[in-house]
């Protein structure tokens, strides 16, 4: 119907416009006219797939009528001025705003010109991630946890460990009606090398410029681990004093030392302090194991050491051990 | 206040042609499409076409494509149809029609009898 | 053509009644629809744009309606000057095209 030879006009507006939830957000929509085509624009009109009746109209005399005034503003159009813009502004974006919406312009002579426009309804997620402290059960468990609140559509969470282990996903409603909430719990096998050691959980989502990282240190709670160093069995009559050290690894730190021997309690030339264990110098060869008992609040556990001191020079003068 | 005011009726002949006038007032002139609309006897109504008073741009009905011409005078914001080769099948009313996408505002009509 | 099938064509009704006219489009026409009223004798008079705003002035009696195909144009408590006839037009494309009318009578 336009006539012959006539250079179309054309209606911009993007295929895909986000918004955030409970905020405000323009669906653009422009009319473009080629340079040497006229056109005159009478008419805008939004209206929604799927609805009745159309949302918002701009009428070239009546001005701008909306199916929910406190909700909708043409952001451009006014009355007598050229209606070439018909960016519509939704207040207060709701879950159910999200669809497919129509831009329509009535022009002369060139007719109805459309454009559609799918608004996405988004929501920011909030991300914590926390360990989940545990004990050496010999089975699998959760060790960490990551949570992304809230999100629309649901955050995508995964895990990045050097430890094995595998994740377990789960979505539930979040507390805002078309929110999701995402948790990822990261189970393993926990042992003692695990605890101290750390995972990452990485969360993406739209609306987030780069993905999310959060660390999260393992606790492994487990009895101690215990060993005796200090002895490299070249300890000699008439040197100075020496030292056994107790190690014990745990989780929770070990609540006391318990030094002994296999005959029972400690001969006089062994003193304990804590952790360590004082050997003074003998004048006679002795051949002792030596138990360092080992308690945290898991239970205790025990390391064993046979120590010998022989007749013969001394190699070093500085003293029995070279510790 | 807006008005469109009509030519008077017209009686005539087969074969004959005839311009029938619409002047405006109460508004810009150059702003708004003028479009014609031909109501025959006891029936509906009948768009004919339009046309920009501004750069002359018109759209017609194909049905009236070679029967009516629109053209306007700005200098009198005066909008006109002319109608050709007419016969019987063109007497009725015709309507001028400030075109908003709807027609907001109508002239009076003109009425066209086409008799021997 | 886009045809708009108005019905009914006539209608009687009583003063304080409520009545509605259909217009059916055979292809989707949007929201692109107005209604007018035609009393007798006089030129056509604009009273619902786009399928469901009043023109300033027109009593809110009248209520349009509908998207699509599918078009309604109610009158609540009607009066004795809406003796009229009623006309359902799409401006969606080229050419425009009128529905066939609905004559209302007052009893």
């Known amino acids: 119907w336009p006539p012959p030879g006539t250079g179309d006009i054309i209606v911009q507006a993007p295929t895909q416009v986000p918004g955030f939830l409970g905020d405000s957000v323009t669906l653009p929509c422009y009319l473009q006219v080629p340079g040497m085509e006229e056109t005159h624009v009478s008419q805008l009109t939004w209206s929604r797939h799927g609805e009745s009746g159309s949302m918002a109209v701009f009428h070239q005399t009546q001005g701008p009528n909306y199916s929910e005034p406190k909700r909708l503003e043409f952001v451009a159009a006014r009355l007598g001025t050229e209606l070439r813009d018909a960016s519509l502004r939704m207040f207060g974006l709701r879950v159910e705003d999200e669809g497919n919406y129509t831009c329509l312009f009535v022009t002369f002579p060139q007719g109805s010109r459309s454009v559609d426009i799918w608004l996405r309804v988004l929501a920011k997620p909030q991300n914590t991630a926390e360990v989940q402290k545990v004990q050496l059960t010999g089975k699998p468990v959760p060790v960490a946890r990551c949570v992304s609140t809230g999100g629309r559509p649901p955050a995508h969470i995964t895990w990045h460990s050097d430890l094995g282990g595998m994740p377990n996903t789960s979505q539930a409603p979040g507390f805002l009606s078309g929110t999701v909430t995402v948790t990822s719990l990261w189970i393993l096998v926990p042992s003692s090398q695990v605890d101290g050691k750390s995972v990452t959980c990485k969360v993406e989502h739209e609306s987030f410029e780069k993905p999310q990282l959060l660390t999260v240190n393992l606790t492994v709670y487990y009895p101690p681990e215990v060993s005796i160093s200090g002895y490299d069995n070249n300890w000699y009559l008439s040197q100075n004093e020496a030292t056994l050290t107790c190690d014990a690894r745990s989780n929770p730190e070990p609540t006391g030392y318990n030094w002994s021997t296999t005959m029972g309690p400690l001969p006089p030339f062994a003193v304990a302090q804590g952790a360590q264990l004082l050997i003074r110098p003998v004048d006679k060869p002795i051949n002792t194991t030596f138990i360092c008992n080992v308690t945290n609040a898991l239970g205790a556990r025990q390391a064993e050491l046979t120590v010998q001191v022989k007749e013969g020079p001394p190699s070093e003068p500085s003293g029995m051990s070279s510790n | 206040e807006v008005q469109l005011q009509q030519s008077g009726p017209e009686l005539v002949k087969p074969g004959a042609s005839v311009k029938i006038s619409c002047k405006t007032s109460?508004?810009?002139?150059?702003?708004?499409?003028m479009h014609w609309v031909k109501q025959s006897h006891g029936k509906s109504l009948e768009w004919i076409g339009g046309i920009h008073p501004n750069n002359g741009d018109t759209s017609y009905n194909q049905r009236f494509k070679g029967k009516a011409t629109l053209t306007v005078d700005k200098s009198s914001s005066t909008a006109y149809m002319e109608l050709r080769s007419l016969t019987s099948e063109d007497s009725a009313v015709y309507y001028c029609a400030r075109w908003t996408g709807d027609f907001d505002y109508w002239g009076q009509g003109t009425t066209l009898t086409v008799s021997t | 053509d886009i045809v708009m099938t108005q019905s009914p064509k006539f209608m009687s009704t009583s003063v304080g009644d409520r009545v509605s006219v259909t217009c059916k489009a055979s292809?989707?026409?949007?929201?692109?629809v107005a209604w007018y009223q035609q009393k007798p004798g006089q030129s056509p008079k604009a009273l619902i744009y786009?399928?469901?705003y009043r023109y300033s002035g027109v009593p809110d009696r009248f209520t349009g309606s509908g998207s699509g195909t599918d078009f309604t144009l109610t009158i609540s408590n009607v009066q004795s000057e809406d003796l009229a006839e009623y006309f359902c037009q799409q401006y969606n494309s080229y050419p425009y095209t009128f529905g066939g009318g609905t004559k209302l009578e007052i009893k």
């Open positions: 109460g508004y810009t002139f150059t702003e708004y499409t």
């Open positions: 292809q989707n026409v949007g929201t692109n």
């Open positions: 786009s399928a469901s």
